[in-house]
Interface confidence: low
Amino acid sequence: GELETSDVVTVVLGQDAKLPCFYRGDSGEQVGQVAWARVDAGEGAQELALLHSKYGLHVSPAYEGRVEQPPPPRNPLDGSVLLRNAVQADEGEYECRVSTFPAGSFQARLRLRVLVPPLPSLNPGPALEEGQGLTLAASCTAEGSPAPSVTWDTEVKGTTSSRSFKHSRSAAVTSEFHLVPSRSMNGQPLTCVVSHPGLLQDQRITHILHVSFLAEASVRGLEDQNLWHIGREGAMLKCLSEGQPPPSYNWTRLDGPLPSGVRVDGDTLGFPPLTTEHSGIYVCHVSNEFSSRDSQVTVDVLDPQEDSGKQVDLVSAS
């Protein structure tokens, strides 16, 4: 006869491991007992359990409550056992020794591999600001046994670097994603992908990129200078910019206070019917917690009685 077993049994942490040992004997042969032992190199043999044809299952005190026979129906020639709730410390070499009658003893070894699935974590880097050089966007760490694979899935252009730390029974892998921040990256997903044989599918953690920036400011409303004449109603200046965080707007007049009747509504400056006192230099100040910008325009209200062209100067400053 001969023993049938597996070279390697692989289970995920917390699952039950079936340690197979089946004696395929000739007609009339009987199995008297099956002894299971842990036989890691250099540590001698430690008995796990013994299945006796007459007296049943015996379990070592070290494994009390954790070793069982497979559920019935059972074949008398089947010496397999179940190791409940596998833990990392169970990983190692096991030996099955079968005593048969009349053929004698047979033995076989298998390796139990306990997979420890990773619990990945993603840590965003420091605040991203446009104008920075190569900057850490996020790091992703996963520890498991065997070592997990950590990669990145994103449309964003960047560079990755990985490092691994080996522990006694596991390995931690950290991957960093570096990029040069630009406003186009705002709202873009950066996904850490962790692969591991103990996972049914890859684990994915997504971080949404936030890049602080503030665009140059400009003022709209003076495109047709002939519209800015005495008596015109509904004249307005609009300050144009964009930023992250969204910017706030403030209007001032460089050559004095804002004239009475001029309304400030966020990015818009609304004028009452125009008079010559509305002529002047107006400044739009745009700011967020990242930066601030200014744009100034010169308004020259035309008197239709006069035959002179209006001058418009546009100046932007940071």
Epitope: L122, P124, A127, P189, I205, T206, H207, I208, E289
Partner: nanobody, 118 residues
Amino acid sequence: EVQLVESGGGLVQPGGSLRLSCAASRSTFSLNIMGWYRQAPGKQREYVATITTGGSTNYADSVRGRFTISRDNSEDTVYLQMNSLRAEDTAVYYCTAELVRRGPTTYWGRGTQVTVSS
């Protein structure tokens, strides 16, 4: 899950002051940005102010110069000092916090009523 609990609302006369507080339940993760929104009857919820972990602040134009936001990172608490209150400041004030964990997740408090009336 992060819980946000506001306090400090009430009735105050125009020109008066109030200080709102918002305490976040302790989290093992960093609360990235905390701040305040408000909603007046019949109107949409509007932004008031926010503050980053580093103490950088941002305000809506309507409250700039009158309201001051501050933060105690060790307690995950944010404050809104409201001075020179006006009738138009009457609203339910909501605390908000963004949790950086697996991407930004925003949490909201239940709100505290502020009424400015003589």
